[in-house]
Interface confidence: medium
Amino acid sequence: LPKAPVITTPLETVDALVEEVATFMCAVESYPQPEISWTRNKILIKLFDTRYSIRENGQLLTILSVEDSDDGIYCCTANNGVGGAVESCGALQVKMKPKITRPPINVKIIEGLKAVLPCTTMGNPKPSVSWIKGDSPLRENSRIAVLESGSLRIHNVQKEDAGQYRCVAKNSLGTAYSKVVKLEVEVFARILRAPESHNVTFGSFVTLHCTATGIPVPTITWIENGNAVSSGSIQESVKDRVIDSRLQLFITKPGLYTCIATNKHGEKFSTAKAAATISIAEWSKPQKDNKGYCAQYRGEVCNAVLAKDALVFLNTSYADPEEAQELLVHTAWNELKVVSPVCRPAAEALLCNHIFQECSPGVVPTPIPICREYCLAVKELFCAKEWLVMEEKTHRGLYRSEMHLLSVPECSKLPSMHWDPTACARLPHLDYNKENLKTFPPMTSSKPSVDIPNLPSSSSSSFSVSPTYSMT
C-alpha cells in the first residue's frame, strides 16, 4: 500500500575536521520510494557537485573534503507524492586545528617607539595565542600585551626587548607554532663622553677624546671650525656597542672641534654632537689676536665696492677667514640681482662693508662697524621695501644657518658718527648730497618718500643730518 515518507533517523549535528570526510544520514521509510533532496543553508545542493557524494538513493550525503566554508545547516527533504514532503535538519560544525594565517615578521624598531608583531590565527574552537621569547613564555605587563587578534604589542620599546620571538596558537585539536622572528631595537646615537676644551701653548699636542653609543654602533667624525678635520690622527676602538675616538692634534691655531656621532636607522640618520674649543695661551702671531686680524682685501666679489687695497677685518673664528667671508658674500650677492636698481648698489656696499669690515690695526686688531646713519640710509631710503622682506625672512628663519651674518645689521645697534667720527665706517658709495640723486637711478616719484640725510663726503668734517636721523 502507498505510504507517505517518514524520516526514521533525524539529522544530527556533525563535527568534522578540515580536509576530512563528513557524512549526514537521512533514513526514510516510504512507498513508493521517495525523491530525496539536500540543501545547505536553504540552497539546493546539486547532484553533480563534485565536492559531494549522494548515495543510498539520496539517504547519505558525504562531503568529501571539508572546508572551513562548509559550516552551516544541512537539511534533507523526502517526497514521494503520497502525503506531504518531510524534512530533517542538522548542523555541520567545522573543527579546525590552529593555523597561523599572518605570522610575525622580523622587526627593527627605534627605542621608545611602539612595536607590533602580528600573529593572526584560524581554528575552531578559536585558538588562544601566547608568545615565547627566547626559550621562555613571555609574560604580559604594563608595556607588553597580547591583543585580541593575537598580535603582540610592546609600548615604549626598550633595549632588553630585543630578541627572538615566536607565537603559539592552541586549541583542543592541536597547537601551531610560528617561525622564530627577530625583534631588533635600534638606539639613537648618544655621546657618553664629550671632548674637553683645552688652553695650550702654540705647537703642543692635544688629544681630544669622544665616546658614543647607539645601536647600530655609531660612526664618529670630527669637524674643525665647520670643515672636516684636515690634519691630525684619529684612533678608534669599539667595544660592547661603545665607540671610542681619539683625535690627536698639533696645535698651531685656535679652533672649535666638534665630535659628531652618527648612526643609521633605515633611510634616516641620527646624530649627536659635542664640541670643545682649543685656545692658545699667549696667542700673539703678528697682527692677530684670537678674534681676527687685519689684511688687505684680496677677494673678487667686493672688489668694486671696497676701496682699493682696503684693510679689512678677517674673523679667525673661521678656519680660513678669507675663504669663509668671501663665500658668505658670494652666496648673498646674487640675491641682490632681484632688488631694485635704486637698492642694489647701496645694498652691495652695505653687505661688503658688513662682512668685510674696515680694520683698525694695532696691538688688538679691531673691526670698525658701519656708521648708523649709513645703515639707516640703506634701510629706510634706498631699500625700504627690500629691507622689510629681509627682516621678515630673518625672523621667520628662512635664512639658512650658515648665512647668519647675512641677516641685515641692526642699524640701531651701530655707533653714530656723531659720537666719534673715527668709531664707525662710512659707505663711500652713499656719500652724496640731496641734490645729487642723479648718481642713482631715478625713483618712480620725483620726490623721495623718506627725507634723505645729508651724509658727509669722506673729506668733509661737518656732520649734519636731517632730523629724521638725529641720534640721541
Epitope: N227, E322, T331, K337
Partner: antibody, heavy 121, light 112 residues
Framework: ELQLVESGGGLVQPGGSLRLSCAAS????????MSWVRQAPGKGLEWVSA????????YYKESVKGRFTISRDNAKKTLYLQMNSLKSEDTAVYYC??????????????WGQGTLVTVSS | QAVVTQEPSLSVSPGGTVTLTCGLS?????????PDWYQQTPGQAPRGLIY???SRHSGVPSRFSGSISGNKAALTITGAQPEDEADYYC????????????FGGGTKLTVL
C-alpha cells in the same frame, strides 16, 4: 697659453690608493680656486672636491669624504688628489678644472683633458 | 641632498631655438645657486658656456644665453648650429648643502 695637465691615473685594486696631479701653466696659479670633477664611463659629470686659492679650506663630495684629500702646492703650480680606499664606483675620468676666481666654488672656466682611474680586481 | 634635474634629451632643427632647463628636486633654483652651464662633445673635456645664471664665458657665441625662468635655470640656444650637438650640463652651487657644487644629469642635444 693656459694649460692643465692631469697625471697619475691607472688601474688599481679595490681598497688601493692613487695620487693624481694636475700641472698648471699659462696663468697665475695661486690666484685661483681649483676643483676635481670626474666622469664615469658613459655617465655625467660629478663634482668631487674643491680648494680655494690659498689652500686654507677643502671641500668634498659626501661619498669621498675621509677617503680623498685635495691639496695644492702653489710654488710648484700643482693641484693634487690623494685617493685612498678606492672603490669600483670611483672608476672614472678625473678632470682638473680651474675656477674663475679665488674662492673654491663657482664657474669652472678651464679644464684639463682628464686622466682615467680604473678600480678593478 | 637635493638632486639637480635636466631633460635627458632634446632635439632642435638647424637655425631653430631650444631651451634646456635645470631644476631642483626640492625647491627652486635661485640666483644664489649661481647656475653654470657646460658643454661637452664626445671624447672632449667639458667647456664652460654660462656662469652665474647669465654671463657668457669668453669666446662663447652670443647665440647661447642663460636665465632663470620660474623656478628653474635655463640655457637657450637661438639659431642652433650643427656643432652645437653635444651634452649640456648645468651645475648649481648649494651653500646650505655642505657647500657643494652639484652637476645635473646632463641633456643630450641633437641638431637634426
Amino acid at each position: 697659453e693656459l694649460q692643465l695637465v692631469e697625471s697619475g691615473g691607472g688601474l688599481v685594486q679595490p681598497g688601493g690608493s692613487l695620487r693624481l696631479s694636475c700641472a698648471a701653466s699659462g696663468f697665475t696659479f695661486d690666484d685661483y680656486g681649483m676643483s676635481w670633477v670626474r666622469q664615469a664611463p658613459g655617465k655625467g659629470l660629478e663634482w668631487v672636491s674643491a680648494i680655494p686659492w690659498n689652500g686654507g679650506s677643502t671641500y668634498y663630495k659626501e661619498s669621498v669624504k675621509g677617503r680623498f684629500t685635495i691639496s695644492r702646492d702653489n710654488a710648484k703650480k700643482t693641484l693634487y688628489l690623494q685617493m685612498n680606499s678606492l672603490k669600483s664606483e670611483d672608476t672614472a675620468v678625473y678632470y682638473c678644472a680651474k675656477r674663475s676666481g679665488r674662492i673654491a666654488f663657482g664657474a669652472l672656466d678651464a679644464w684639463g683633458q682628464g686622466t682615467l682611474v680604473t678600480v678593478s680586481s | 641632498q637635493a638632486v639637480v634635474t635636466q631633460e635627458p634629451s632634446l632635439s632642435v632643427s638647424p637655425g631653430g631655438t631650444v631651451t634646456l632647463t635645470c631644476g631642483l628636486s626640492s625647491g627652486s633654483v635661485t640666483a644664489s645657486n649661481y647656475p653654470d652651464w657646460y658643454q661637452q662633445t664626445p671624447g672632449q673635456a667639458p667647456r664652460g658656456l654660462i656662469y652665474s645664471t647669465d654671463s657668457r664665458h669668453s669666446g662663447v657665441p652670443s647665440r647661447f644665453s642663460g636665465s632663470i625662468s620660474g623656478n628653474k635655470a635655463a640655457l637657450t640656444i637661438t639659431g642652433a648650429q650643427p656643432e652645437d650637438e653635444a651634452d649640456y650640463y648645468c651645475a648649481l652651487y648649494m651653500y646650505s648643502d655642505s657647500k657643494l657644487y652639484v652637476f645635473g644629469g646632463g641633456t643630450k642635444l641633437t641638431v637634426l
